[in-house]
């Protein structure tokens, strides 16, 4: 009998409000044994896959998707889904990335720390991305 897969969580480091030109890393978490994590965007057809999965704790695995230099085009809702053979999980809730112009420079510490979406934030809107596919093992230095 197939196990019931828990929904993934998604968070952003250093936060969800990122100055233009700064970096952000999306962290997707799921159970141990995940083979592939996928990061999707609401109403966008693009996605990123990675098989670079590390163990975050005895019961959790994670993958990190980094955007080196955030632009206005990177703003919007993101969500994670993972593949643990032989099936995919449900999608996480969406996490909204906000990109703001800043006069403080790229190292300005005015991001919101610890932002994440577990099963309590905005519900997944299944109207667009249920049918996504995947690219292999992309490092997120060059996301989108």
């Amino acid at each position: 009998q197939e196990e019931d897969l828990p929904r993934p969580s998604i968070s952003a480091e250093p936060g969800t409000v990122i100055p233009l030109g700064s970096h952000v890393t999306f962290v997707c978490r799921g159970p141990v044994g995940v083979q592939t994590f996928r990061l999707e965007r609401e109403s966008r057809s693009t996605y990123n896959d990675t098989e670079d999965v590390s163990q975050a704790s005895p019961s959790e695995s994670e993958a990190r998707f980094r955007i080196d230099s955030v632009s206005e085009g990177n703003a919007g809702p993101y969500r994670c889904i993972y593949y643990k053979p032989p099936k995919w999980s449900e999608q996480s809730d969406y996490l909204e990335l906000l990109v703001k112009e800043t006069s403080g420079g790229p190292d300005s510490p005015d991001t919101e720390p610890g932002s994440s979406a577990g099963p309590t934030q905005r519900p997944s809107d299944n109207s667009h991305n249920e049918h996504a596919p995947a690219s292999q093992g992309l490092k997120a230095e060059h996301l989108y």
Epitope: S43, R44, Y47, P133
Partner: antibody
Framework: QSVKESGGRLVTPGTPLTLTCTAS????????IQWVRQAPGKGLEYIGA?????YTYYASWAKGRVTISRTSTTVDLKMTSPTTEDTATYFC?????????????WGPGTLVTISS | ELVMTQTPASVSAAVGGTVTIKCQAS??????FAWYQQKPGQSPKLLIY???KLASGVPPRFKGSGSGTEFTLTISDLECDDAATYYC?????????????FGGGTEVVVK
């Protein structure tokens, strides 16, 4: 990397027919597969799709007339009770890496003829 | 149901000329959009997706633009080999309306 359709043949109206899309050289679990058909001399017509995450979609005209299912290496299109209007070349296609919107990998097609 | 309206149905242009094909979606479809080229007896070939990214191996004479509900394919410096039928497709609708739909096609004749 390729996809190939099989199962197309001549059948009489009302005879169930199953077409199979077989994936080679890539892991099917990561991809959406769509089925498209083209009647002789006509345009492309979307039938439906099987998504990487296990969802299945159908064009409104195809609901109840076809069933799409997948295994780890194939995606099947079952025509439950075909009519002469279903005579066409049937294609399956896989989307491009990193973007769900474009289907870059197409099979050569398989010809289905429904005739009494 | 999502409907893609493609115009014109046929267009003729001389070698070296420019052809513009338009596609209108009945609802906003985000970036879930692509253009395909098909020649008689062949499978469709992906040209543009997302909706302005050039597919691998496609020359930059082909350009896609648009967003929301209005999309355009422009073929410049037309070559004889460009004679084909071109289709637009969206595959980003919702569960209730079916997420795949093709335009009716545009036959491009090169003189």
């Amino acid at each position: 990397q390729s996809v190939k359709e099989s199962g197309g043949r001549l059948v009489t109206p009302g005879t169930p027919l199953t077409l199979t899309c077989t994936a080679s050289g890539f892991s099917l679990y990561k991809y959406n597969i769509q089925w498209v058909r083209q009647a002789p001399g006509k345009g492309l017509e979307y039938i439906g799709a099987s998504t990487y995450a296990g969802y299945t979609y159908y064009a409104s005209w195809a609901k109840g007339r076809v069933t799409i299912s997948r295994t780890s290496t194939t995606v099947d299109l079952k025509m439950t009770s075909p009519t002469t209007e279903d005579t066409a070349t049937y294609f399956c296609a896989r989307h491009i890496d990193g973007d769900y919107s474009g289907y870059a990998l197409w099979g050569p097609g398989t010809l289905v003829t429904i005739s009494s | 149901e999502l409907v893609m309206t493609q115009t014109p149905a046929s267009v003729s242009a001389a070698v070296g000329g420019t052809v513009t094909i338009k596609c209108q979606a009945s609802q906003s479809i985000g970036t879930w959009f692509a253009w395909y080229q098909q020649k008689p007896g062949q499978s469709p070939k992906l040209l543009i997706y997302g909706p302005s990214k050039l597919a691998s191996g496609v020359p930059p004479r082909f350009k896609g633009s648009g967003s929301g509900t209005e999309f355009t394919l422009t073929i410049s410096d037309l070559e004889c080999d460009d004679a084909a039928t071109y289709y637009c497709q969206s595959n980003g609708g919702s569960i209730s309306n079916g997420w795949g739909s093709f335009g009716g096609g545009t036959e491009v004749v090169v003189k």
